[in-house]
């Protein structure tokens, strides 16, 4: 996860009611019994602020020691912090639990602003309106951090829910979905919706509001309208998908899909924008401008670096163009379309206390290590991380926001011939392929 | 040609709030863009505030939240209301109109300008 335009976490209001939902089609392929249908005491167990990330309650513990943990799709340890900070209300603490185990050993985890280290365990651990299971999961806990923690954010540690593969210090520290699955019944899948508000809130506002829901198991049909559709996992580290096609506003960006996905393309909700490689994002731009240059903006919106502000209520959303991803399918040759709208990528600016304005800053930015597919994308969408099968089901999603003229959408199938070729190869740079 | 006079401009208590207006007059060349820019005691001339064509909006971002900026319907007069004022605030504040540009809070960007309105904040 890249740590530093982390993701946005708003309230649920704003989008299609729930249970309000399209037939459904028949043509899906059933799924393993208990995985679907209803989970209805996890539904909501999200919340969270625009830009900050979005949180669950777990505990940590005996007696239990109840914390607020972001949900980053995009790192691979649990980590809370476990000594005072000045933006932590609480923290871990260790020799108040019965059932720590010290491993005796360090972790160190540097970002690219920032860092974080502490010192690796295990406790008991819960999650109170997920499964009802308790099991014994690795803990990182943080000692000191820099540029990590979030003041007002609300959230005190952090869920790494990818693959052993990129957990610190290295892939023999399982991760907490591997030990959840390895320890219960609990199915080897988790479902993510994330509601963004489509305007800001004030700290009360968040506190009282929904952020969306983690369905740990399952797949909760209430969250979604239409059909799911799967792109396979390319590789288990990150959540890895390739990205086959981008179009702005039924535009195809016409560039070689590899750079799409150079040097790779991740799902990850702990990142708040949308972000792209450097070749990809100057192009979307350029289209972008062009499609809304009804308007101006200043240079600096398009770097994320100015807010665009309109009279309340005026915001001309239908000046600026839908965005689509075409992601490679499960079948050969065949693709599905994931679109969304400028209120997903248009990101309401909380500090903006005037009523008399709604302010945005641009939510896609640039990356110099691959696609990031951050909470811009996953606000639009159901996000089903079937682990067990390999692959990343999207369905449009029941809190997305939109206006009476557009929706996000998620549609297929689509012919696209040689997908395999849009993946980029990371060259290997252990010392096993240096040949001398 | 064009002229601009702003208006609004006093004394103030640490928290208080003030409205400033600025009236164009003259020339009937549209200009699209409009801002106002500060200049406090012993430091630069910077972007408060910007406006093009009386909808889209941006702000300094340090001043973000407090103030908003805004046109009348015929965009002959310009305002900034300012909330939550600190002593920090205290500057000439100027008004400023021209054809723009991709930095809409570069002085540079603006063609014509008032002669400004003071704003003292008082602690």
């Known amino acids: 996860t890249q740590h530093g335009i982390r993701l946005p976490l708003r309230s649920g209001l704003g989008g299609a009611p729930l249970g309000l939902r399209l037939p459904r089609e028949t043509d899906e392929e059933p799924e393993e019994p208990g995985r679907r249908g209803s989970f209805v005491e996890m539904v909501d167990n999200l919340r969270g602020k625009s830009g900050q990330g979005y949180y669950v309650e777990m505990t940590v513990g005996s007696p239990p020691q109840t914390l607020n943990i972001l949900v980053d799709t995009g790192s691979s340890n649990f980590a809370v912090g476990a000594a005072p900070h000045p933006f932590l209300h609480r923290y871990y603490q260790r020799q108040l639990s019965s059932t720590y185990r010290d491993l005796r050993k360090g972790v160190y985890v540097p970002y690219t602003q920032g860092k974080w280290e502490g010192e690796l365990g295990t406790d008991l651990v819960s999650i109170p309106h997920g499964p009802n299971v308790t099991v014994r999961a690795n803990i990182a806990a943080i000692t000191e951090s820099d540029k990590f923690f979030i003041n007002g954010s609300n959230w005190e540690g952090i869920l790494g829910l990818a693959y052993a593969e990129i957990a610190r210090p290295d892939d023999s520290l399982e991760p907490f979905f591997d030990s959840l699955v390895k320890q219960t019944h609990v199915p080897n899948l988790f479902s993510l919706q994330l509601c963004g508000a489509g305007f800001p809130l004030n700290q009360s506002e968040v506190l009282a509001s929904v952020g969306g829901s983690m369905i740990i198991g399952g797949i909760d049909h209430s969250l979604y309208t239409g059909s799911l559709w799967y792109t396979p996992i390319r590789r288990e580290w990150y959540y890895e998908v390739i990205i086959v096609r981008v179009e702005i506003n039924g535009q195809d960006l016409k560039m070689d899909c590899k750079e799409y996905n150079y040097d790779k393309s991740i799902v990850d909700s702990g990142t708040t924008n949308l972000r792209l490689p450097k070749k990809v994002f100057e192009a979307a731009v350029k289209s972008i401008k062009a499609a809304s240059s009804t308007e101006k903006f200043p240079d600096g919106f398009w770097l994320g670096e100015q807010l665009v502000c309109w009279q309340a209520g005026t915001t001309p959303w239908n000046i600026f163009p839908v965005i689509s991803l075409y992601l490679m399918g499960e079948v050969t040759n065949q693709s599905f379309r994931i679109t969304i709208l400028p209120q997903q990528y248009l990101r309401p600016v909380e500090d903006v206390a005037t009523s008399q304005d709604d302010c945005y800053k641009f939510a896609i930015s640039q990356s110099s290590t691959g696609t990031v597919m951050g909470a811009v994308i996953m606000e639009g969408f159901y996000v089903v991380f079937d682990r067990a099968r390999k692959r990343i089901g999207f369905a449009v999603s029941a809190c997305h926001v939109h206006d009476e003229f557009r929706t996000a959408a998620v549609e297929g199938p689509f012919v696209t011939l040689d997908m395999e070729d849009c993946g980029y190869n990371i060259p290997q740079t252990d010392e096993s392929t240096l040949m001398t | 040609d064009v002229q601009l006079q702003e208006s609004g401009g006093g004394s103030v208590q640490a928290g208080g709030s003030l409205r400033l207006s600025c009236a164009r007059s003259?020339?009937?060349?549209?200009?699209?863009?409009m801002a106002w820019f500060r200049q406090g005691p012993g430091k630069e001339r910077e972007g408060v505030a910007a406006?093009?064509?009386?909808?889209?909006?941006t702000y300094a971002g340090s001043l973000q939240g407090r103030f908003t900026i805004s046109q009348d319907n015929d965009k002959n007069t310009l305002y900034l209301q300012m909330n939550s004022l600190k002593p920090d605030d205290t500057a000439v504040y100027y008004c400023?109109?021209?054809?723009?540009?991709?930095?809409?809070?570069?002085?540079?960007?603006?063609?014509?300008w008032g002669k400004g309105t003071q704003v003292t904040v008082s602690s």
């Open positions: 400023a109109a021209g054809n723009g540009g991709g930095n809409w809070l570069r002085p540079s960007e603006y063609n014509y």
């Open positions: 003259g020339g009937t060349v549209s200009i699209p863009y």
């Open positions: 406006i093009y064509d009386g909808r889209a909006k």
